[in-house]
């Protein structure tokens, strides 16, 4: 097989015919050294998935349910290109499965038992698989056959295409359960009509169904959405209140050696030449031989799926939960309203050791999961492999953009017993230099810089945001002669100063000696000219407070702060000499786990928090000998957020604006994936 050939998998004679036409037309418009198409015919989409996994084909386009099959071992395929619908300016690659109710009704998602339900059709995504998958563990046992369990859960339903003889309750609202538009309650519009007519109490449809059926906002305002957290929202808040986000139609490839760049190059060229309204002789998104061949006829084009986005992230936690429940039919033994152990995400093996000790002391209420970077941890929380972790504000922003929510804040200044209920203002982000140097904020160009990590508040977002507004470009590695900013490209000058050791050089975790607040300060002590840290870093690592060899003889008076007005001040005066106020670190979790995480952590800190005085013979949650493992070592307590329970409210408008501006310079693959 030539290196630049993409073997497309076709699942019918008609698809194979279109594939050959696709191949021939691409040959006529692409240079001989460009990508080419080859066609492989298989009997089904599942056979195509297996063929790609076995390297007998390279690509196929799949519906969401099949993307799930493709992702499962041993297939291990990943999404590489998404079809989009709507306009190029506002491309839609996903739809949202929602539960619609009338505003004047008064029940929540956890009170659906005994209500009347309207569905688009048996086995369909938004109308059946997702809602029934998510409700699966609430269905009465035995849960097989599924239709019987659903019939016994609701007091009456309309499920088009169901067997009305065996399951009459499923056809109670639409006698016969007709499987076509002859049934007035069939499909999306039909299920909505079933609700509108008052036949049912809830309709399981797509987010767009309401807008397509009710052009008038006043009419739409008579309806609401049921959210998974047992609240309701208006119908236009579907992005924050849905059962699952469902990808429409996706090209998949192998996770390793999958030719994703070649596939994108091919499809990008194909949409340029043969996309909507581009060519008379061959159309990518239609065919005389049949409907939806190779690609959906309704598609308007393709978008490249960000490389960080694997199938779990693409399909989303809710969708995977729903499909897994339906397929595997397994439910936790514990009742769903009881808190299961919380899986904490630990960064690399140093945090993992502390987490393990916590787990032993918590009597198993805490479990541990590891990842090599903060972004990998956030991804694990998103997909349910982990539940929670404490993050710097810069990562609270990324986690928030990825759908996680802040749960508790680390407090550093408020003594107990008021600590738990106090909202602190934050800490100061400062620039530290040696007293012996002549540096000021205005002559940092060409100097050696030390950063906690890329994407963190005091070490990156605040100083680089201020720098960006001064230099108007993102080439920070050219502004400083060299530096250590863990998480930078390995060949960047901002990795040159890092200490490693080798395979971990410049990695954004504790294996890199210059990572974090203490690491950035160490970088200044040993190699750098300026360190961007929190205001407490110098006092915490001088005067013998840090016993490590590099720090034990350091004196606080040998360091000063740079002020934005060009002056310098003592490290004792951060309130009058700082770059900005930074939001405290905060614990984040998935929305569905937030309450359990909060309850458990408040309980854990009562046992292992700052009230424990002897950490040499007791486990201390907020202690790791200046290394800030799992939590900052100067944490006094974890505090309730009260109404600051979204990332925007928690971080504050000013900080969110600053980080959003800095996104022009973003090197965050996760953020790119979460905003796809």
């Amino acid at each position: 097989v030539p290196e630049k050939s993409v073997r497309w998998c076709a699942v019918s004679e008609h698809e194979a015919t279109k594939c050959q036409s696709f191949r021939d037309h691409m040959k006529s418009v692409l240079p001989s050294n460009g990508p080419s198409v080859a066609c492989v015919k298989k009997a089904s989409h599942l056979d195509c998935i297996r063929a790609i996994a076995a390297n007998e084909a390279d690509a196929v386009t799949l519906d969401a349910g099949l993307v799930y099959d493709a992702y499962l071992a041993p297939n291990n395929l990943k999404p590489v290109v998404a079809e989009f619908y709507g306009s190029k300016e506002d491309p839609q690659t996903f739809y949202y499965a929602v539960a619609v109710v009338k505003k004047d009704s008064d029940f929540q998602m956890n009170q659906l038992r005994g209500r009347k339900s309207c569905h688009t059709g048996l086995g369909r995504s938004a109308g059946w698989n997702i809602p029934i998958g998510l409700l699966y563990c609430d269905l009465p046992e035995p849960r097989k056959p599924l239709e019987k369990a659903v019939a016994n859960f609701f007091s009456g339903s309309c499920v088009p295409c169901a067997d009305g003889t065996d399951f009459p309750q499923l056809c109670q609202l639409c006698p016969g359960c007709g499987c076509s538009t002859l049934n007035q309650y069939f499909s999306y519009s039909g299920a909505f009509k079933c609700l509108k007519d008052g036949a049912g109490d809830v309709a399981f449809v797509k987010h767009s169904t309401i807008f397509e059926n009710l052009a008038n906002k006043a009419d739409r305002d008579q309806y609401e959405l049921l959210c998974l957290d047992n609240t309701r929202k208006s119908v236009d808040e579907y992005k924050d209140c849905h059962l699952a986000r469902v990808p429409s139609h996706t090209v998949v490839a192998r996770s390793v050696g999958g030719k994703e760049d070649l596939i994108w190059e091919l499809l990008n060229q194909a949409q340029e030449h043969f996309g909507k309204d581009k060519s008379k002789e061959f159309q990518l998104f239609s065919s005389p031989h049949g409907k939806d061949l190779l690609f959906k006829d309704s598609a308007h084009g393709f978008l490249k799926v960000p490389p960080r986005m694997d199938a779990k992230m693409y399909l989303g936690y809710e969708y995977i939960t729903a499909i897994r429940n339906l397929r595997e039919g397994t439910c936790p033994e514990a009742p769903t309203d009881e808190c299961k152990p919380v899986k904490w995400c630990a960064l690399s093996h140093h945090e993992r050791l502390k987490c393990d000790e916590w787990s032993v002391n918590s009597a198993g209420k805490i479990e541990c999961e590891s990842a090599e970077t903060t972004e990998d941890c956030i991804a694990k929380i998103m997909n349910g492999e982990a539940d929670a972790m404490s993050l710097d504000g810069g990562f609270v922003y990324i986690a928030g953009m990825c759908g996680l929510v802040p749960v508790l804040a680390e407090n550093y200044n408020t003594p107990n017993p008021n600590c738990e209920n106090t909202a602190e203002e934050g800490y100061f982000a400062v620039a530290v230099v040696k007293s012996s140097s002549d540096l000021t904020w205005d002559n940092l160009k060409g100097k050696k810089s030390c950063h906690t990590a890329v994407g963190r508040t005091a070490g990156w977002n605040i100083p680089m945001g201020l720098l960006y507004s001064k230099i108007n470009h993102c080439r920070f590695d050219e502004f400083f002669s060299e530096g250590c900013a863990p998480g930078s490209e390995k060949n960047s000058s901002l990795c040159k100063l890092c200490m490693g050791p080798s395979p971990n050089l410049c990695e954004p975790n504790n294996k890199e000696g210059y990572y974090g607040y203490t690491g950035a300060f160490r970088c200044l002590v040993e190699k750098g000219d300026v360190a961007f840290v929190k205001h407490q870093t110098v006092p915490q690592n001088t005067g013998g407070k840090n016993p490590d060899a590099w720090a034990k003889n350091l004196k606080e008076e040998d360091y000063e702060l740079l002020c934005l007005d060009g002056s310098r001040k003592s490290v004792q005066e951060p309130a009058n000499c700082h770059l900005a106020r930074a939001p405290n670190h905060a614990v984040v979790a998935r929305k569905d786990k937030a309450d359990c995480v909060q309850t458990l952590l408040l309980d854990q800190q009562r046992m292992f928090g700052s009230s424990v005085t002897d950490c040499s013979s007791n486990f201390c949650l907020f202690e790791s000998k200046t290394k800030d493992l799992l939590f900052r070592d100067d944490t006094v307590c974890l505090a309730k957020l009260h109404d600051r329970n979204t990332y925007e409210k928690y971080l504050g408008e000013e900080y969110v604006k600053a980080v959003t501006n800095l996104r022009k310079c973003s090197t965050s693959p996760l953020l790119e994936a979460c905003t796809f």
Epitope: L353, K354, E357, V360, F619, K625, K627
Partner: nanobody, 117 residues
């Protein structure tokens, strides 16, 4: 800080048993948490079992019901009783008391356990 020395490993058939010991050079009475870890070739080191001063224990899912951790403060020794051994239990086993902080790599020699027929 006490020094810890592991012993008791060896070659055993699937289904067999071993008892690992970890002898401390000083008193372990005031040590809060002690634990056994293991590392198989090419794998990360993982927690097998842990025990607190008060006797609270935690086990990895893969060993629950087969392994038992205990400590004898009078003998300054930590134990791991391993029953119904499986080939996947093959690894070097280490004990720790977490007392050196989490940052330094402070593992001892460990003791090799090989489960094979």
């Amino acid at each position: 800080q006490v020094q810890l020395v592991e012993s008791g490993g060896g070659l055993v058939q699937p289904g067999g048993s071993l008892r690992l010991s970890c002898a401390a050079s000083g008193s372990i009475a005031s040590i809060n948490t002690m634990a056994w870890y293991r590392q198989a070739p090419g794998q990360q080191r993982e927690l097998v079992a842990g025990i607190t001063r008060g006797g609270s224990t935690k086990y990895a899912d893969s060993v629950k019901g087969r392994f038992t951790i205990s400590r004898d403060n009078a003998k300054n020794t930590l134990y791991l009783q391993m029953n119904s051994l499986k080939p996947e239990d093959t690894a070097v086993y280490y004990c720790t008391d977490y007392s050196r902080g989490y940052y330094q790599d402070y593992w001892g020699q460990g003791t090799q356990v090989t489960v094979s027929s």
